[in-house]
Interface confidence: low
């Protein structure tokens, strides 16, 4: 008799793939075209990335540091009208892209939550949640919650409103904190809250340290669904050298939880390469003409257009990983087991019941390494085979689909491998 299938967990939409943050509409669209109507025209691009949700804004009226002139129910006219927003929502729904609205109140000011009048601001947020839920948004994001007094209790209240409307609605909170204890205290009082933080940003870009951070986090959060990013808002290039971007993309897409990216992460957008552009929101490089400030600063391989035409580009890797993440059961909701593979390496298995299994091996170092995969670290339910098929490498030159002997696995500097192997009873 065939073994009984394991019961599938309840899957919310944000469990099925990545979220894509567009914090600055104008920078995302460029050429002074930063409005909701223009964003609607970019939804096909978001579809091509296979992302499940768009985290938008803030786009509400906010006069810097002025509570009275901050209206969370009104869209700043620079971004468009309520009709434009409704139209964007409709188009996004047709393309199966959910829209999450950032309601961080004082986004143009010094303190995102204003320094005083906490209760007034909290009431405004509460009213805004109800208003925008009725308008059809799929969730909300609030950032810089370390600046919000009594954040846990407010988040619990806002979560109740959101979930009370529908279990299918999401609340994301963002913090600049990278301290695990602070992060856990925010999570403890808020079931189902998705929290983005700077937890992974000080991973020091070493395999051992990253492994330790990831496993500590997963052990501490238990069965909770978590999210993976390097910060609540900033680009991967703010924290990582170019040679580690592919590795981190592979990792973020294959860890158990929701990967969260900022616009431009898929092409390695780097503010430091664009003189005069703000680190937190550089202009998106659609093509070479997107940054006319200094001609020649942008080459084709830095742009969406150039990378779309190159199967070996970061963007092509992002698309492939996003596709795998959204359709493979083991990556969607599979168990996670990290195990030793040697100094400088981080490796883990993702598996679900009798479905195809995945092995991830990441070399964070700048030297080539032989992987000594210690299968003894793994439970019987997640044992390693002698060979696994190469699904993809972050580096060019390997023959995809070819079986690799796991005992003789060698990785190039900064290389990550995604291997697949079948369930064996």
């Amino acid at each position: 008799r065939a073994p009984r299938c394991r019961e599938l967990p309840a899957q919310k939409w944000w469990h099925t793939g990545a979220l894509y943050r567009i914090g600055d509409l104008q920078a995302f669209q460029g050429h002074g075209a930063g409005n909701l109507a223009g964003l609607k025209g970019r939804l096909d691009y978001l579809s091509s990335l296979k992302v499940k949700g768009l985290v938008l804004g803030p786009i509400h009226k906010n006069q810097k540091d002025d509570v009275a002139q901050t209206d969370l129910l009104q869209i700043d006219p620079n971004f468009g009208s309520k009709e434009d927003f409704d139209s964007l929502l409709q188009s996004a729904k047709k393309k199966s892209i959910r829209v999450i609205l950032d309601l961080t109140p004082n986004y143009r000011g010094e303190n995102s939550w204003f320094s005083t009048q906490v209760d007034t601001v909290a009431t405004k947020v509460k009213d805004a949640l109800e208003f925008w839920l009725q308008a059809g948004v799929d969730g909300f994001q609030v950032r810089d919650i370390e600046n919000l007094k009594d954040a846990s209790s407010f988040l619990a209240e806002w979560q109740n409103i959101t979930k009370g409307f529908s279990e299918d609605r999401l609340l994301i909170a963002g913090t600049n904190s990278s301290d695990l204890q602070q992060i856990l205290s925010l999570l403890e009082s808020n079931k189902d809250l998705l929290l983005t933080s700077s937890y992974l940003s000080d991973s020091g870009s070493t395999g051992e340290h990253t492994k330790s951070l990831v496993t500590q986090y997963l052990n501490a959060t238990g069965n909770r669904w978590c999210s993976w990013s390097l910060s609540q808002a900033r680009l991967l290039t703010s924290f990582l050298p170019a040679q580690l971007l592919r590795l981190y993309q592979l990792m973020l897409f294959t860890l158990p939880g929701t990967p969260v990216f900022s616009y431009g992460d898929e092409i390695g957008l780097d503010a430091a390469a664009l003189p005069g552009q703000p680190m937190e929101a550089p202009v998106m490089l659609w093509d070479e003409s997107s940054f006319p400030d200094i001609p020649g600063a942008v080459s084709a391989n830095m742009t969406v257009k150039g990378q779309s035409e190159d199967p070996g580009s970061l963007l092509s890797l992002f698309r492939r990983l996003s596709d795998q993440r959204s359709k493979e059961r083991s990556l969607l909701h599979g168990d996670f087991h990290a195990f030793s593979a040697g100094p400088g390496l981080f490796s883990y298995i993702r598996h679900w019941d009798q479905n195809e299994r995945f092995l991830v091996v990441l070399n964070f170092g700048d030297v080539g390494l032989s992987a000594g995969l210690q299968a003894s670290d793994l439970p019987a339910s997640a044992s390693l085979p002698a060979k696994a098929d190469l699904l993809l490498s972050t580096q060019p030159g390997r023959e995809e689909g070819s079986p690799l002997e796991l005992e003789r696995l060698k990785l190039e500097p900064h290389e990550g491998l995604l291997l697949r192997f079948p369930y064996a009873a």
Partner: antibody, heavy 122, light 113 residues
């Protein structure tokens, strides 16, 4: 009117760190970028790096590992720090204003300081 | 990096003479989007800091006498002084601002005959 003035030590020991200040007036560091250029005695000009209006920096790759440019907008001052100085770093160091037309930053320099001569010698 | 070369390295002239000096870049400085050449010329008199003369290869900075004429496109540029005055004795540098890092030519020194 627009003015830039460099200040700092005239003599630095080899292997030590050079610290220079560029004090500006007549324009805001929140609007314009400021660059540093150096000129060894009897030689040509070398662009060292820039600090942009938003505080971002770009450096000449040949100096990147040793160079740091920062600023204090409230004091209208831009700072250059360069470590591990050798005798070949002996030069006149200039700060200059990066051109800005209200929309774009273009990389030519419309106002210069008078320069400060720095000798690296024991 | 873009390499800028200048010829001649020095030139002896008499007052009233017409002078031309050349600047060549290792890559084109013409941006097809706006048809502009990203090249500037500076004048540096002895003991002084450089002074911007010309930008966009041919646009004179305000206050610069019209005897200074910039021309050229792509990789080859020329600075012409139509009638040299004594106060023009200086070193002239070209500089590209098309790519990072910005680079200067080695200079052309104008001396009195």
């Amino acid at each position: 009117q627009v003015q830039l003035k460099e200040s700092g030590p005239g003599l630095v020991q080899p292997s030590q760190t050079l610290s220079l200040t560029c004090t500006v007036s007549g324009f805001s560091l929140s609007t314009y970028g400021v660059i540093w250029v150096r000129q060894p005695p009897g030689k040509g000009l070398e662009w060292m790096g820039v600090i942009w209006a938003n505080g971002n920096t770009n450096y000449n790759s040949t100096l990147k590992s040793r160079l740091s440019i920062s600023r204090d907008t409230s004091k209208s001052q831009v700072y250059l720090k360069m470590n591990s100085l050798q005798t070949e770093d002996t030069a006149t160091y200039y700060c200059a204003r990066h051109y800005y037309d209200g929309t774009y930053y273009y990389g030519y320099f419309d106002y210069w300081g008078q320069g400060v001569m720095v000798t690296v010698s024991s | 990096d873009i390499v800028m070369t200048q010829t001649p390295s020095s030139q002896a002239v008499s007052a009233g003479e017409k002078v031309t000096m050349n600047c060549k870049s290792s890559q084109s400085l013409l941006y097809s989007e706006n048809k502009k050449n990203y090249l500037a010329w500076y004048q540096q008199k002895p003991g002084q800091s450089p002074k911007l003369l010309i930008y966009w290869a041919s646009t004179r900075e305000s206050g610069v006498p019209d005897r200074f004429i910039g021309s050229g496109s792509g990789t080859d540029f020329t600075l012409t002084i139509s009638s040299v005055q004594a106060e023009d004795l200086a070193v002239y540098y070209c500089q590209q601002y098309y790519y990072f890092p910005y680079t200067f030519g080695p200079g052309t020194k104008l001396e009195l005959k």
